[in-house]
């Protein structure tokens, strides 16, 4: 008998300093480009090697970005979200939601999987 897959959702504040080549990640999502069904949120689709986000190590592909410098990312067009990041300044504070896959075995064993992407 297979265990069911659940998700453990956690939130984290990540402070990044924009590096020589920027923050170093890609995003998908927005009200005009839903990445997840019935969710117009902004998600990390790619983290670039040696960029600020990669060197910091906390932001993961598949994370949902809830806010940038305290500004909520709900109900934004995709390009508006991109512009918000590009104009966010040198020190950038991200509120992110990590979604960890948790395997529940038949006898309640919990094993953490990789972040969903």
């Amino acid at each position: 008998m297979n265990g069911r897959v659940d998700y453990l959702v956690t939130e984290e504040e990540i402070n990044l300093t924009r590096g020589p080549s920027g923050l170093g990640f890609n995003i998908v999502g927005g009200t005009d480009q839903q990445y997840v069904s019935n969710d117009s949120g902004i998600y990390v689709s790619r983290i670039k090697e040696n960029g600020a986000a990669a060197l910091d190590g906390r932001l993961q592909e598949g994370d949902k970005i809830l806010s940038v410098n305290g500004q909520d990312l709900k109900n934004l067009l995709h390009q508006d979200a991109v512009d918000l990041f590009r104009n966010a300044g040198y020190a950038v504070s991200l509120r992110v939601q990590h979604r960890l896959q948790v395997q529940n075995g038949p006898i309640g064993h919990r094993g953490e999987g990789d972040p969903s992407g």
């Epitope: 689709s45 790619r46 990041f85």
Partner: nanobody, 127 residues
Framework: QVQLVESGGRLVQAGDSLKLSCAAS????????MGWFRQAPGKEREFVAG????????YYGDSVKGRFSISRDNARNTVYLQMNSLKPEDTAVYFC?????????????????????WGQGTQVTVS
Amino acid sequence: QVQLVESGGRLVQAGDSLKLSCAASGRTFSTYTMGWFRQAPGKEREFVAGTSPSGDNRYYGDSVKGRFSISRDNARNTVYLQMNSLKPEDTAVYFCAAFRGSCVDDGCDFRVSQYDYWGQGTQVTVS
């Protein structure tokens, strides 16, 4: 992942126009930033034009501004490069490229290293 196939390259005369096409596989084409690059013999690959996932934002390399125009049809999974007033120095292999989503840094769309997926290229020769 996406696979990209360019077409439309050929030999033309200086001053002529030409339209290149790039057909992409996959159902999520509308979430990809698309770009055109070119590479002349003995030279580095050069950014030509790019378009945001929706097609609302378009950007061009300095050497083609005012002559080339990029567009995309998300219903047909295709991106186009309309090239007008062609010059001999436009002779190169033209590559279609893509990456998922949008990069959040200024100028990132212009960098070869930003793009994850590449076509095989189509030759354009201007005599």
